[in-house]
């Protein structure tokens, strides 16, 4: 029997053992948020893996995500969404410690997702555990980056209150409108619903005592945000070791001055 | 004066494994990312992991992702580099690489680099 | 192939000046520094640009770095038979989590 033709793609394929993976991380997830255990995990298993499989792999559309999406439906309480932009890690130490505040990441179908990488082909029923389509050489919709652009934009459309976002101040660009939180999250915040979005801007050095919300960029995103009747506030965090710390421990003599 | 010294190249096997160390001396260590980057014979620089100043995260090339591991002990001032499931590709120099910066979380470029050990791997 | 492209050869007579070009996109050099190595034969790489256009102390002011949205370069002016070398670009991806290195130039002092 000769091996059926396989589309070459130029990304890395499938996360080997993707929905055991999946399943594993849903069922952890629901024991541990009491607000999510009547979420049926094969249910949800069963939601995403129809939004790809058996579907041509550069052709996928947030059509396809939204019964994961229904299943997946959860709301973070005003004041607590942080949004991050290319400073995943210390965001996600942050509400690590902060644990009444939420990344995506934090929510079912972020964690579910969090660095995985998932595809299928047309007209089979089988993922895809050699390659999948790169988003710049191969497509954009594909399954992995169309996940990401729907629940990113769900995310911001459902924040309320005070809106937190962490920029990377390490960057040349420190608000980069193609990333997902410029091209997607930014423009699908509810002004009728978020009052104020405030930034805090990570420094990187320790040499480095600029202050970056004077940045261009910055500037840029000011406004954008306000074109859109949301308050914009920025601070600078010039020491994020020390703004863990003061999280993990306000009382500490230290925390009083400044971060 | 900083200095990088790398160690634990030499032949090996297809499938075998190797562990490269990288001594530092000269700076805080437990301040600066660190890296590995290697290059193929006759080849350009190919950047193969990093390290975080507390070693709480890497990222690995994709060319090396699951059978190569970054650490550190900033206690012994060095940096490790764990080869399993060594190809015939991973044959180069294998240079040691300190960040730019004092960083309290990212990764940053490298600005002192060790003078390299040789991993050849062939049967 | 890398995904940031460098012309595989450049040359230039004592004096002269030569660019040397790094090609990349809008998840690299567009939103990230750009960093430029000197190599010379048998010898680790060295640190001559950092942050698209600063130079390290000792670096000779014959090097500048530029950069402009997805593209960066690398100028040596009044060349000299020492600066005979290879030259790497680099940076970080976000779409790829990790540093890029662009294949190189090599320099040649005719």
């Known amino acids: 029997v000769l091996p059926r033709w396989r589309q070459q793609w130029s990304g890395s394929g499938t996360t080997s053992r993707f929905p055991e993976t999946v399943l594993a991380r849903c069922v952890k997830y629901t024991e541990v948020h009491p607000e999510m255990r009547h979420v049926d995990c094969q249910s949800v298993w069963d939601a995403f893996k129809g939004a790809f499989i058996s579907k041509y792999p550069c052709n996928i559309t947030e059509e396809d995500y939204q019964p994961l999406v229904k299943l997946g439906t959860q709301t973070v309480p005003c004041n607590k969404t942080l949004l991050w932009s290319r400073i995943k890690d210390l965001a996600h130490q942050f509400t690590q410690v902060q644990r009444d505040m939420f990344t995506l990441e934090d929510m079912l179908l972020g964690y579910l997702a969090d660095d995985l990488t998932w595809c299928g082909e047309f007209n089979t029923f089988e993922i895809n555990y050699q390659s999948c389509p790169d988003w710049r050489k191969d497509c954009s919709n594909n399954p992995v980056s169309v996940f990401w652009k729907t629940v990113s934009r769900r995310f911001a459309e459902t924040a309320c209150g005070v809106v937190h976002v962490m920029l990377n101040g390490s960057r040349s660009k420190i608000f980069d409108k193609n990333s997902t939180f410029g091209s997607v999250e930014v423009h699908n915040l509810q002004p009728e619903k978020v009052q104020a979005l405030e930034a805090w801007v990570i420094h990187g050095g320790r040499e480095d005592s600029r202050d970056l919300c004077q940045d261009p960029t910055i500037k840029e995103l000011e406004s954008i945000i306000s074109k859109r009747n949301i308050r914009f506030f920025c601070k600078n965090i010039y020491r994020p070791d020390k703004f863990l710390q003061c999280v993990k421990n306000p009382e500490d003599s230290s925390c009083l001055s400044g971060i | 004066e900083v200095q990088l010294l790398e160690s634990g190249g030499g032949l090996v096997q297809p499938g075998g494994s190797l562990r490269l160390s990288c001594a530092a001396s000269?700076?805080?260590?437990?301040?600066?990312?660190m890296s590995w980057v290697r290059q193929a014979p006759g080849k350009g620089l190919e950047w193969v992991s990093v390290i975080s100043s507390k070693g709480g995260s890497t990222s690995n090339a994709d060319s090396v992702k699951g059978r190569f591991t970054i650490s550190r002990d900033n206690s012994k001032n060095t940096l490790y580099l764990q080869m399993n499931s060594l190809r015939a590709e991973d044959t180069a120099v294998y240079y040691c690489a300190k960040g730019m910066e004092r960083q309290y979380y990212s990764y940053n470029a490298m600005d002192v680099w060790g003078q390299g050990t040789t991993v050849t791997v062939s049967s | 192939q890398s995904v940031l492209t460098q012309p595989p050869s450049a040359s230039g007579t004592p004096g002269q000046r030569v660019t040397i070009s790094c090609s990349g996109s809008?998840?690299?050099?567009?939103?990230?520094?750009v960093y430029w190595y000197q190599q010379l034969p048998g010898t680790a790489p060295r640190l001559l640009i950092y942050k698209d256009d600063q130079r390290p102390s000792g670096v000779p002011d014959r090097f500048s770095g530029s950069k402009s949205g997805t593209s960066a370069s690398l100028a040596i002016s009044g060349l000299q038979s020492e600066d005979e070398a290879d030259y790497y670009c680099a940076t970080w991806d976000d779409n790829l989590n990790s540093w890029l290195f662009g294949g190189g130039t090599k320099l040649t002092v005719l």
């Open positions: 000269g700076f805080t260590f437990e301040d600066y990312a």
């Open positions: 809008n998840s690299n050099i567009d939103v990230d520094y």
